[in-house]
């Protein structure tokens, strides 16, 4: 008789990452009988919802269902119908919604209520929509990359699955950059974490981890730009803002009301004698860098060492995976290679920012001008944040690995979030470990 393949006993999970600038839906898959093994969960699909982040629907909440339809339909197509009812769906909203909640708890709740109602209409096992904390965002990002890199497995491998993987079991730190916040998470070297708010204790696969994490709200790339503009317009002599973070020849009119819409610019708010101002790019990396540094208050630190704004940061330790916008921006600028030194990155940023806007537009015709215009700022901001904010140096720069995907799964908080909520990371090492490659029965 012919051998028949047994039906695949697999499980699926869906996580929606409701970020400040957009929403992405991730579909994960794993063998049902290996749930507690490390590294078995992998991403089978990412569907990026076409449109802005959910916080932008605050004035038209009734349309959130329309906005989510295409990606939820895609999930219905990808996941076999028989598995729909057993597939958990989680939505986690990050800093965009944290900011909306700061402005109005009622409006944030209304957005989440409609999200929940919309997602409950689908044939999946909807588990709720919530605003995750910055600490969770950092922690789950750290769990994701270390899970995918195989850092939690007790067996050291003789091969590397990714170019920057070291064979030791030292975990990677996680650097996450979004539109509205940025997270830094790592295991410090035998260092006490002086600030309890920044300390996390995990027991994963039989090993204890003392993890440092902090999320800087308003220091994602988009909110940092709003902060910089609000700071710089304070000292402008008229309604022209000559801005070194935009290419020479670039011009854009900004409404003052838009500038002061976000809670992130409140500290710079003042009554201006005009309702609009015009950004005029002058494309100077060094001046842009200096302007960005003014967003980091390093004059006060109640601990042995701080990042900025009085936030404790232990000495950096080990390798770091930098993902989300750290990766997207550096990828666009072609600066993700392991071989590119920090000095070279700075040099290339200087050249890029100095390029005339008309030249840039011609070179990147397929990129929306709003986004294209901001790469000079974003690249400079990343360098400023990593070097002056987090105290990386020219030497330790080589320990930063700009990561988009690991083994086909996106680096980010969503996988760690799902692993945690589905109890797929055991505290103790599973008793029966799978057979290794070299073992045959």
């Amino acid at each position: 008789t012919q051998n028949k393949a047994l039906p695949e006993n697999v499980k699926y999970g869906i996580v929606l990452d409701a970020g400040s600038s957009h929403t992405s839906l991730y579909i994960y898959k794993w063998p049902a009988e290996k749930e507690n093994d490390t590294g078995v969960v992998h991403q089978v699909e990412e569907c990026r919802v076409k449109g802005p982040g959910i916080s932008k629907f605050v004035q038209k909440v009734n349309e959130i269902g329309i906005y989510l339809t295409d990606c939820m339909e895609r999930a219905r197509e990808v996941i076999p119908a028989a598995k729909h009812h057993a597939t958990p769906v989680y939505l986690g909203a990050t800093a965009g919604m944290r900011l909306l909640r700061m402005e109005s708890e009622e409006l944030a709740d209304r957005v989440l209520d409609v999200v929940e109602r919309s997602l409950s209409n689908y044939p999946f096992d909807f588990q709720g929509a919530r605003i995750i904390t910055g600490q969770e965002e950092g922690a789950y990002g750290w769990i994701t990359i270390n899970y995918l890199l195989g850092k939690f497995s007790q067996k050291t491998r003789w091969f590397s699955i990714v170019p920057y993987e070291t064979n030791n079991q030292e975990t990677f730190g996680a650097l996450d950059l979004g539109g509205a916040s940025t997270q830094v998470t790592f295991v410090p070297q035998n260092q006490t974490i002086e600030s309890p708010d920044n300390a996390l204790q995990f027991r994963l696969y039989g090993k204890d981890y003392n993890v440092y994490t902090h999320s800087f709200l308003c220091y994602g790339k988009d909110q940092a730009l709003w902060q910089k503009l609000a700071k710089d317009i304070q000292v402008a002599s008229n309604e022209i803002l000559r801005d070194p973070c935009f290419h020479p020849g670039y011009k854009k009119v900004v409404n003052v009301s838009d500038l002061y819409k976000t809670p992130c610019t409140k500290r710079f708010e003042m009554t201006l004698p005009f309702q609009q101002f015009e950004i005029q790019g002058i494309g100077n990396y060094q001046q842009c860098h200096q302007s960005i540094l003014e967003l980091f208050n390093t004059s006060y630190c109640p601990y042995s060492q701080c990042a900025f704004n009085g936030i404790f940061l232990p000495p950096l330790q080990g390798d770091f995976g930098a993902f989300s916008a750290f990766y997207f921006v550096m990828k666009f600028l072609n600066l993700t290679s392991e071989k590119v030194s920090q000095e070279k990155v700075t040099e290339m940023m200087k050249k890029f920012c100095a390029q005339p806007w008309e030249e840039i537009k011609t070179s990147y015709a397929g990129v929306k001008e709003k986004y294209l215009s901001e790469y000079c700022f974003s690249g400079t901001y990343i360098l400023s944040l990593l070097l002056q904010g987090y105290h990386f140096t020219a030497d330790s720069w080589e320990h930063i690995h700009f990561i988009g995907k690991i083994q086909g799964s996106d680096a980010g908080w969503t996988l760690g979030y799902m692993l945690n909520l589905t109890n797929m990371i055991p505290a103790e090492q599973p008793l029966s470990t799978p057979l290794s490659h070299s073992t045959y029965v």
Epitope: K50, P52, Q59, K60, D70
Partner: antibody
């Protein structure tokens, strides 16, 4: 400003194939879906299908399956419609279009190409 | 396939008056609490233009005199007050399920 620029009119012989293009400017083609719509002279609109340029996923009206193939090239911000085994029934104006939310604000808008006239005749 | 039947096939309305166009679907176009019905306007020699999406939401830049209503299988497009620039063909369109389909069209003229 969002624009969809379609290739020029085509006169082709029955049995031949043709590839129509739709160049997108003002936004990244990956941030939207591109629909293709057929309109014969003095007739209604027929939806051919839709492509998601971010990943190449497509949806077709089954009656155009085998006749039409939608593709996209994200590096040139261009969508394509390939029509094969042409007959006189394929003579029509073909539109590429996007409709959906803007990626910055929750504004729902549409943009259409000017249309490409395809004439199939010996 | 979901068949959309528009009525009337043609309509003449005086300036300032109300124009109502109906669209009936062969089965419900509602799903997940949303009515997947859209309305397009087309003028001679031009591509169509989106007026209404999801039964009742106005497209960006669409004048307030255009409104949509309905759910399930019965939908209508209203124009009030009718203006000269509104003389055109109007099509309903469902995007509930593939294949997406259009109605046969209604020709709106000025009386």
């Amino acid at each position: 400003e969002v624009q969809l620029q379609q290739s020029g009119a085509e006169l082709v012989k029955p049995g031949a194939s043709v590839k129509l293009s739709c160049i997108v400017s003002g936004f990244n083609i990956k941030d939207t879906y591109i629909n293709w719509v057929k309109q014969r002279p003095e007739q209604g609109l027929e939806w051919i299908g839709r492509i998601d340029p971010a990943n190449g996923n497509t949806k077709y009206d089954p009656k155009f399956q085998g006749k039409a193939t939608m593709t996209s090239d994200t590096s040139s911000n261009t969508a394509y419609l390939h029509l094969s085994s042409l007959t006189s029934d394929d003579s029509a104006v073909y539109y590429c279009a996007r409709w959906g939310y803007d990626d910055e604000e929750a504004d729902y808008f549409d943009s259409w190409g000017q249309g490409t006239t395809l004439t199939v005749s010996s | 396939d979901i068949v959309l039947t528009q009525s009337p096939a043609s309509l003449a309305v005086s300036l300032g008056q109300r124009a109502t166009i109906s669209c009936r679907a062969s089965e419900s176009v509602d799903n997940y609490g949303i009515s997947f019905m859209n309305w397009f306007q087309q003028k001679p020699g031009q591509p169509p233009k989106l007026l209404i999406y999801a039964a009742s939401n106005q497209g960006s830049g669409v004048p307030a005199r255009f409104s949509g209503s309905g759910s399930g299988t019965d939908f209508s497009l209203n124009i009030l007050p009718m203006e000269e620039v509104d003389a055109a063909m109007y099509f309903c369109h469902q995007s509930k399920e593939v294949p997406w389909t259009f109605g046969g069209g209604t020709k709106l003229e000025i009386k």
